[in-house]
Interface confidence: low
Amino acid sequence: PEPPTACREKQYLINSQCCSLCQPGQKLVSDCTEFTETECLPCGESEFLDTWNRETHCHQHKYCDPNLGLRVQQKGTSETDTICTCEEGWHCTSEACESCVLHRSCSPGFGVKQIATGVSDTICEPCPVGFFSNVSSAFEKCHPWTSCETKDLVVQQAGTNKTDVVCGPQDRLRA
């Protein structure tokens, strides 16, 4: 018979013959022949292969280096790589999460719009009129100015984006 030129899914062509690929979690030991099936072996501990494959070596699991601020988010299996994330207060510098940097703080005059996560940095926003932030923080939002009126007081000093208003007693009319 004419040798195949196209193999089905999960097969590969070798020596004019279609052989089965090794399933995820296993590596190729030997190609199939006219008389034998493809021979595959499971990946060892700390190794993985995540696709149907004909790889002769499994990949090493990623190492989450604590010196780079990394820790294990999800332990790898024979079919999946280890997923690293960053220690509290830090976030990944890339999608691959190969290293971490400290979450940025929002300066006075700016508040936290979105608190940082393991993969994204703090998002700051300028405090709008009526709000202030007098600290550098990775958590604090802009606070509304104190309402002097509700305390039966009057504004003695206007607020800014960095300072609260200063309230004081109302002037009494002297007789």
Partner: antibody, heavy 118, light 106 residues
């Protein structure tokens, strides 16, 4: 890995069409199968055929009498030739790599639009 | 050849809405694969081996099915999901695609 199609924008009916796919970032003789797919006006996709890294080919039976896929390994290019074209062959032509490990086309060119008209 | 029929051909969904589209094969297939295509771009790998998400695909997407009946589901529609989705099989030659489901945002 990047794929880039090139060829004429316009071909006359009954002539032959020749398109080139230039691959960068991966050798077409290393592994995988390298395909041509076209998309007609109205967006229907049709698989045309492929050349395997070993050089063997496989074509859609609907095109078998008119199609040829070849390659130039020194330039890391593969080619589509379609004979006796008609207006029905007007389409956007894509080249793509099929990754059997995931069973999908993992890299595509941006496509080249061909019009068949006299 | 195996014919893949996608339905509906067109649908629109509001943000947050659950969306399901189907792909029916004329004969049984082992796996179904899905691509997303936005206007003026090439198709992107989206779901492979029926239910596995390609790299970078949001977790709100899922795929399921077996035999002749397969589906793609979005748990909560977002504006960026508006696109045309194609199913594809290669359990038998020739490789075939469905005609696509065009999904728009309301």
């Amino acid at each position: 890995v990047q794929l880039q199609e090139s060829g004429p924008d316009l071909v006359k009916p009954s002539q032959s069409l020749s398109l080139t796919c230039t691959v960068t970032g991966y050798s077409i003789t290393s592994d995988y199968s390298w395909h041509w797919i076209r998309q007609f006006p109205g967006n229907k996709l049709e698989w045309m055929g492929y050349i395997y890294y070993s050089g063997s080919t496989n074509y859609n039976p609907s095109l078998k009498s008119r199609i040829s896929i070849t390659r130039d390994t020194s330039k890391n290019q593969f080619f589509l030739q379609l004979n006796s074209v008609t207006t029905e062959d007007s389409a956007t032509y894509f080249c793509a790599r099929f990754y059997y490990g995931y069973s999908f086309f993992d890299y595509w060119g941006q496509g080249t639009t061909l019009t068949v008209s006299s | 050849q195996i014919v893949l029929t996608q339905s509906p051909a067109f649908m629109s969904a509001s943000p947050g809405e659950k969306v399901t589209m189907t792909c029916s094969a004329s004969s049984s297939v082992s796996y179904m694969h899905w691509y997303q295509q936005k206007s003026g771009t090439s198709p992107k790998r989206w779901i492979y081996d029926t239910s596995k998400l390609a790299s970078g695909v949001p977790a709100r997407f899922s795929g399921s099915g077996s035999g002749t009946s397969y589906s793609l589901t979005i748990s909560s529609m977002e504006a960026e999901d508006a696109a045309t989705y194609y199913c594809q099989q290669w359990s038998s030659n020739p490789l075939t695609f469905g005609a696509g489901t065009k999904l728009e945002i309301k």
